[in-house]
């Protein structure tokens, strides 16, 4: 599930149901955001590469008491093969950069959209 980029001609391959639901949840969060998401909580930025699901979970799991992203946290855990707990960090984190949760979610969504457009949009 973490390898998305190898679309072969002639056409793209749509995502699995689980990945589709993750994208839809990220869309819901970004489109329905009224007040600052998670009270403006900051999380470590990540490198959006092969292990991004675990890295994203490692970053977001440090946000507690934010119901708006609980579903996203659960979904990401389904894409990460190992158990993730708060305070755990991988080399994929950009440890000197913290961003708001809202921006983190938006960046993750944009990256997933780019991955699925690869191989279909020239």
């Amino acid at each position: 599930l973490t390898c998305l980029g190898g679309f072969a001609s002639p056409g793209p391959v749509p995502p699995s149901t689980a990945l589709r639901e993750l994208i839809e949840e990220l869309v819901n969060i970004t489109q329905n955001q009224k007040a600052p998401l998670c009270n403006g909580s900051m999380v470590w930025s990540i490198n959006l590469t092969a292990g991004m699901y675990c890295a994203a979970l490692e970053s977001l799991i440090n946000v507690s008491g934010c119901s708006a992203i609980e579903k996203t946290q659960r979904m990401l855990s389904g894409f990460c093969p190992h158990k993730v707990s708060a305070g755990q960090f991988s080399s994929l984190h950009v440890r000197d950069t913290k961003i708001e949760v809202a921006q983190f979610v938006k960046d993750l969504l944009l990256h997933l959209k780019k991955l699925f457009r690869e191989g279909q949009f020239n």
Epitope: P10, P12, V13, P14, K113, K114, R117, F121, N122
Partner: antibody, heavy 119, light 107 residues
Framework: QVQLVQSGADVKKPGASVKVSCKAS????????IHWVRQAPGQGLEWMGA????????AYNQKFKGRVTMTTDTSTSTAYMELRSLRSDDTAVYYC????????????WGQGTLVTVSS | EIVLTQSPATLSLSPGERATLSCRAS??????LHWYQQKPGQAPRLLIY???QSISGIPARFSGSGSGTDFTLTISSLEPEDFAVYYC?????????FGGGTKVEIK
């Protein structure tokens, strides 16, 4: 509310080109792909291609490759579809429609632009 | 290219009757199948997405089912405003394709 407003009807001669515009409002333009679909009189729907406004990347139906160009102007949230070397069988209503990602449904449509190709 | 075949081409029914429209794909498209309604002189309108997911604002009498290659749109009890042409659309792979349409007309 989301709206896609297209340019008005056009009459063209065979061999000419037509450029149809589609102005989007009510949502963040770069968040959605713009797809173009046409419908000849009394016929069904035919997908022509799509553009990702964020990157300018395009995907065209092989049937129209070489004759169609899709572009966007993000400053005005407007998409354009140009069809060249027009033939009489290009007479159709041309629709723009938005899709979050290609596998999503076409949830909002423009009102359509009738292009008539006649000598 | 995924070919979608809709049947019947025309369905003649009376208001209050049940309408069952079929769409068959030339290959497995999972649930990446969407349904649209089109009335004369109007743009198509989305009715059902991902084969069976309903759209807010669309009456509950419209429902979809199916997966893989065989899909069905059901209108449980036809209202006068439901007489129109219905199209299915492949969202699985490029080129995106539409079925030829089913015209639901008043008997």
């Amino acid at each position: 509310q989301v709206q896609l407003v297209q340019s008005g009807a056009d009459v063209k001669k065979p061999g000419a080109s037509v450029k149809v515009s589609c102005k989007a409002s009510g949502y963040t333009f770069i968040d959605y792909e713009i797809h173009w679909v046409r419908q000849a009189p009394g016929q069904g729907l035919e997908w022509m291609g799509a553009i990702d406004p964020e990157t300018g990347g395009t995907a065209y139906n092989q049937k129209f490759k070489g004759r169609v160009t899709m572009t966007t102007d993000t400053s005005t949230s407007t998409a354009y579809m140009e069809l060249r070397s027009l033939r009489s069988d290009d007479t159709a209503v041309y629709y723009c429609t938005r899709i979050l990602l290609y596998y999503y449904p076409m949830d909002y449509w423009g009102q359509g632009t009738l292009v008539t190709v006649s000598s | 290219e995924i070919v979608l075949t809709q049947s019947p081409a025309t369905l003649s029914l009376s208001p209050g009757e049940r309408a069952t429209l079929s769409c068959r794909a030339s290959q497995n498209i999972s649930d990446y199948l969407h349904w649209y309604q089109q009335k004369p002189g109007q743009a198509p309108r989305l009715l059902i997405y991902y084969a069976s997911q309903s759209i807010s604002g669309i009456p509950a009498r419209f429902s979809g089912s199916g997966s893989g290659t065989d899909f069905t749109l059901t209108i449980s009890s036809l209202e006068p405003e439901d007489f129109a042409v219905y199209y299915c659309q492949n969202g699985h792979s490029f080129p995106l394709t539409f079925g030829g349409g089913t015209k639901v007309e008043i008997k």
